[in-house]
C-alpha cells in the first residue's frame, strides 16, 4: 500500500530510452499519443513530472517489516494526464484523471545502473513499461537477469 | 530487526590482500541495493562501493577501481569487498550499508558497526 | 563528478538554540539528498531522505529543506544528545558524501 497521499519528492525530467531515443507526448484527437522518436539535434525534450511515493511492501511478500519500502512513481508529462498501464491491451497509454490516482498509474521504481530506471507496474508485477515497435509497450520480465534488458531501460535527465 | 555485520578488518602490509565480508539479517536481501562506505580515522565518510540487488552492476570510488571487488550471494544474504594492491591511504572503518528502499540505489537506511583496516608496514 | 560543500565546518551553539547546517552541490541534485549524524564511536544514522524526509525514530525537531543545489538541516531546539558530526550525502549521480559539520554545545 503507499503509505502516504502525498510524494516524498517530485522530479521534472526528459525520459529517453538506453538507446538515447526520446520519449515525446503529441495531442491528437483530443487524446494524447506516446512516441519513441530521434529527436532533431536542437529539438526541444519533452519533460515529465515524477512524482515518488513510498510503499509498502505487501507483507506476504517480505520479511521486512516497517523495513520493506519501495518507491513507486506516477509519470505526468502535462496537467491532469498520466500514463496509465493497460494490462489488458499490454499497452501504455495517457489518461486524463483525478486524485486519487488509481493503482494502474503506480508503477515500482527500479534501477539496475546508477543512471537507468525502470518502472514495474503495480497491478501487474513482473511486468514493465517498455519500447516495442517505436511505441511503449507493457513488457514481461520472466527473471532478474533480465531486468538489465535493455528495452526496459530508461534514462532521467533534466537537459 | 535489521542486522549488518562486517568482518575481515585487521592489519596488512601495503601491496596485500584483504577479504570484508558483512552478513545481513532481518530484511529480504536480495531486494536491496548493498554498499561499503569508508572513513579514515579522524576524517569524513567515503563512499567505496555499491552493487544493485541481483548483483549484476557494480560501481567503484575511482581511487579503487581495478583494486577493490564489491560481490554479493545472495542465498548466504553476504556482500563481499576484496582488496588488493593495499595502501596505506585505505587505512579507515569500513562500514556495509543497506539501500533504503527495494530495489533502488537511494540512501543508506541501515549500517553495520564496521570493521578497522589499518595498513601499514 | 558532484562535489558537496558543507558549512560551517563547525558549529557551537546553547542548548534549546535553533541550528542550521548547509550543503551546496556543485551541480543539480534534484533533490536526491540525505543528512546522516555520526555521534563518537558509532556508525552514521540516517536522519532525512529525499531532502525533506524525515526516517522513522528521528526527533521532530530534525527537518531538512533545499532544492537545486542549496540545501539545508535544521535542528529546531538544539538537544544535549544531538552533539554529533552531520554528513549531506547525494545519490542523484554517482554517491558523494559532504566533508560534515561537526556540532558541539557551548
Known amino acids: 500500500s503507499i503509505t502516504g497521499i502525498s510524494p516524498i519528492t517530485e522530479y521534472l525530467a526528459s525520459l529517453s530510452t538506453y538507446n538515447d531515443q526520446s520519449i515525446t507526448f503529441a495531442l491528437e484527437d483530443e487524446s494524447y499519443e506516446i512516441y519513441v522518436e530521434d529527436l532533431k539535434k536542437d529539438e526541444k525534450k519533452d519533460k515529465v513530472l515524477l512524482s515518488y511515493y513510498e510503499s509498502q511492501h505487501p507483507s506476504n511478500e517480505s520479511g521486512d517489516g516497517v523495513d520493506g519500502k519501495m518507491l513507486m512513481v506516477t509519470l505526468s508529462p502535462t496537467k491532469d494526464f498520466w500514463l496509465h498501464a493497460n494490462n489488458k491491451e499490454h499497452s501504455v497509454e495517457l489518461h486524463k484523471c483525478e486524485k486519487p490516482l488509481p493503482d494502474q498509474a503506480f508503477f515500482v521504481l527500479h534501477n539496475m545502473h546508477s543512471n537507468c530506471v525502470s518502472f514495474e507496474c503495480k497491478t501487474d508485477p513482473g511486468v514493465f513499461i517498455g519500447v516495442k515497435d517505436n511505441h511503449l509497450a507493457l513488457i514481461k520480465v520472466d527473471s532478474s537477469e533480465n531486468l538489465c534488458t535493455e528495452n526496459i531501460l530508461f534514462k532521467l535527465s533534466e537537459t | 530487526e535489521v542486522q549488518l555485520v562486517e568482518t575481515g578488518g585487521g592489519l596488512v602490509q601495503p601491496g596485500r590482500s584483504l577479504k570484508l565480508s558483512c552478513v545481513a539479517s532481518g530484511f529480504t536481501f536480495s531486494n536491496y541495493w548493498m554498499y561499503w562506505i569508508r572513513q579514515a580515522p579522524g576524517m569524513g565518510l567515503e563512499w567505496v562501493s555499491s552493487?544493485?540487488?541481483?548483483?549484476?552492476?557494480?560501481y567503484y570510488l575511482d581511487s579503487v577501481k581495478g583494486r577493490f571487488t564489491i560481490s554479493r550471494n545472495n542465498a548466504e544474504n553476504t556482500v563481499y569487498l576484496q582488496m588488493n594492491s593495499l595502501r596505506s591511504e585505505d587505512t579507515a572503518t569500513y562500514y556495509c550499508?543497506?539501500?533504503?528502499?527495494?530495489?533502488?540505489?537511494?540512501?543508506?537506511?541501515?549500517w553495520g558497526q564496521g570493521t578497522l583496516v589499518t595498513v601499514s608496514s | 563528478d558532484i562535489q558537496m560543500t558543507q558549512s560551517p565546518s563547525v558549529l557551537s551553539a546553547s542548548v534549546g538554540d535553533r541550528v542550521t547546517l548547509s550543503c551546496k552541490a556543485s551541480h543539480n541534485i534534484n533533490k536526491h539528498l540525505d543528512w546522516y549524524q555520526q555521534k563518537v564511536g558509532e556508525a552514521p544514522k540516517l536522519l532525512i531522505y529525499f531532502t525533506n524526509n524525515l526516517q522513522t525514530g528521528i526527533p521532530s525537531r530534525f527537518s531538512g529543506s533545499g532544492s537545486g543545489t542549496d540545501y539545508t538541516l535544521t535542528i529546531s531546539s538544539l538537544q544535549p544528545e544531538d552533539v554529533a558530526t552531520y554528513f549531506c550525502?547525494?545519490?542523484?549521480?554517482?554517491?558523494?558524501f559532504g566533508q560534515g559539520t561537526k556540532v558541539e554545545i557551548k
Open positions: 550499508a543497506k539501500g533504503h528502499f527495494s530495489y533502488t540505489s537511494y540512501s543508506f537506511a541501515y
Open positions: 550525502f547525494q545519490y542523484n549521480s554517482g554517491w558523494t
Open positions: 552493487i544493485n540487488n541481483d548483483g549484476g552492476n557494480t
